[in-house]
Interface confidence: medium
């Protein structure tokens, strides 16, 4: 079962863990008693669409809640372990109240206020670091984000966002805390194509589909203008005018040997004789320059069974 937590006297809104993209109605129950939770807003705990609302939450609300999604051919049940904690007396936020850590490494970085999208909130969100209100101009609250300019290791710590949830003319406070750590500074490096090798020849079968992946690494961290792309006879794929040959939309990002890499895949739906005479160039480029590996296609030799 999934876990959710909140603080006493604050609003807590949770979603059914089974819901996925379902639009079917959701019913909520107290798991231990099987008692149905009402939808009437006059109750302190009530159901609204797929959400269960505690307005406000109390320590005694802690327990396991069941949600059932009723669809014509299948009922799905999910369980949610809800824990309501008393507000910590000191500034030290215990681990069990912390949301996932955010890792920053760039000159500008943002921290998102966790779970805020579940609530009916209005700006501004207030932000605190280690319980102190953030007032330096370097810290900018915008929508559900906190932007930090010129991040340094001194900015590491626990960041708490506080906002107001409005329901039925009443305002409820919500606070959420997450840690922020600063990774080592990223760097940009001249690109290197790790695959395919330089002047590589690839074997293909006429009439069959073929795909060639090109991977290049650029450095670590932010890569402004880094890209991997394919050219056919020195023409970008989109302008080549051959519908059978397409460059896959988007770039797969990965990390290889502590370095950030991009992969672009060239797909040929059905290889023709003409394709064997073309030159396929994989280009990797960033602010530091460009590197090119040329690939050719060759007909796969049939296996000699003599």
């Amino acid at each position: 079962s999934k876990s959710s937590w909140g603080l006493e006297n604050e609003a807590l809104i949770v979603r059914c863990p089974q819901r996925g993209r379902s639009t079917y109605p959701v019913e909520w129950y107290y798991s231990d008693t099987n008692e149905s939770i009402p939808t009437q807003k006059r109750n302190r705990i009530f159901v609204s669409r797929d959400r269960l609302k505690f307005l406000p939450a109390r320590v005694e609300d802690s327990g396991i809640y069941a949600c059932v999604i009723r669809s014509p051919n299948l009922n799905k049940t999910g369980y949610l372990n809800v824990t309501i904690h008393k507000k910590p007396p000191s500034c030290n936020i215990p681990d069990y109240l912390m949301y996932s850590t955010v890792r920053g490494s760039d000159k500008n970085f943002k921290i998102t206020c966790p779970t805020i999208d579940l609530y009916n909130w209005t700006a501004p969100v207030q932000w605190f670091k280690n319980c102190k209100a953030l007032q330096e101009p370097r810290f900018r609250a915008h929508r559900s984000y906190l932007f930090i300019d010129n991040v340094t290791h001194d900015d590491e710590g626990d960041y708490t966002c506080q906002f107001t949830h409005a329901e039925n003319g009443t305002n409820y406070i919500v606070t959420a805390t997450r840690s922020f750590t600063v990774e080592e500074k990223g760097f940009s490096m001249f690109p290197v194509i790790t695959n395919p090798p330089y002047n590589h020849t690839m074997e293909v079968e006429i009439g069959k589909p073929a795909s060639i992946a090109c991977s290049a690494c650029f450095g670590k961290g932010s890569h402004f203008l880094a890209d991997v792309l394919w050219q056919i006879n020195k023409t970008v794929v989109g302008n080549f005018g051959e519908a059978r040959i397409q460059e896959e939309e988007g770039r797969n990002e990965s990390s290889s040997n502590d370095m950030d890499c991009l992969t672009s895949v060239l797909r040929i739906t059905g290889v023709t004789e003409k394709d064997l005479s073309l030159e396929y160039d994989c280009l990797a480029l960033n602010l530091h320059g460009m590197i090119r590996h040329t690939i050719r296609l060759r007909r796969k030799q049939p296996i000699d069974h003599r």
Partner: antibody
């Protein structure tokens, strides 16, 4: 055959200038980053500079930044290193090297000797 | 800058010996490591790139291993032509840096 051939080394006084050349053959020159690496007498290897395939980007070791300029002429398949304000500590064998797979120097020239002395 | 340290700085070995040279980077460089052999008066020659990939034409008695900060070059059975100085090099970031070298001579 893939080959790199340096020239232009010699004896020069401190504060003087020298231009090294490296003629490349046997490969598509513009497809590769090219580099200068030096080795002082009895010492280890020291990377000096790198230039991208079309010369749009250059990198330098701190020890030569502002004094040395790397350039290339792809029509002549030639790499250059313009060395100004030379110091005694620039005395070394200068190698031209091609940057290959995984940014390793896969092809090296035979080297040209630069001596900075009064 | 990333510092590269090599050990030993020199070693004496006999033909047929198994020789191991280690290189340590001052920070993690993944597998962005190369090894070179240099003989007196000659240019360096690439042996290994990407920490463990043997350069074309290099005898299989040479092998490389390691990732992160610790790397090893191994010569499984030393041959007369292997007496030389060996350098490691990181290409993870600029400035590209080399180790100080390990001289392998005849015992």
């Amino acid at each position: 055959e893939v080959q790199l051939l340096e020239s232009g080394g010699g004896l020069v006084q401190p504060g003087g200038s020298l231009r090294l050349s490296c003629a490349a053959s046997g490969f598509t020159f513009s497809d590769y980053y090219m580099n200068w690496v030096r080795q002082a007498p009895g010492k280890g290897l020291e990377w000096v500079s790198t230039i991208s395939g079309f010369g749009e980007s250059t990198f330098y070791a701190d020890s030569v930044k502002g004094r040395f300029t790397i350039s290339r002429d792809n029509s002549k398949n030639t790499l250059y290193l313009q060395m100004n304000s030379l110091r005694a500590e620039d005395t070394a064998v200068y190698y031209c090297a091609r940057l290959g797979a995984a940014r390793a120097f896969d092809i090296w020239g035979q080297g040209t000797t630069v001596t900075v002395s009064s | 800058d990333i510092q590269m340290t090599q050990s030993p700085s020199s070693l004496s070995a006999s033909v047929g010996d198994r020789v191991t040279i280690t290189c340590r980077a001052s920070q993690s460089i993944g597998s962005w490591m190369a090894w070179y052999q240099q003989k007196p008066g000659k240019a360096p020659k690439l042996l290994i790139y990407a920490a463990s990939t043997l350069q074309s034409g290099v005898p299989s008695r040479f092998s490389g291993s390691g990732s992160g900060t610790d790397f090893t070059l191994t010569i499984s059975s030393l041959q007369p032509e292997d007496f030389a100085t060996y350098y490691c090099q990181q290409s993870y970031t600029t400035p590209i840096t080399f180790g100080p070298g390990t001289k392998v001579d005849i015992k």
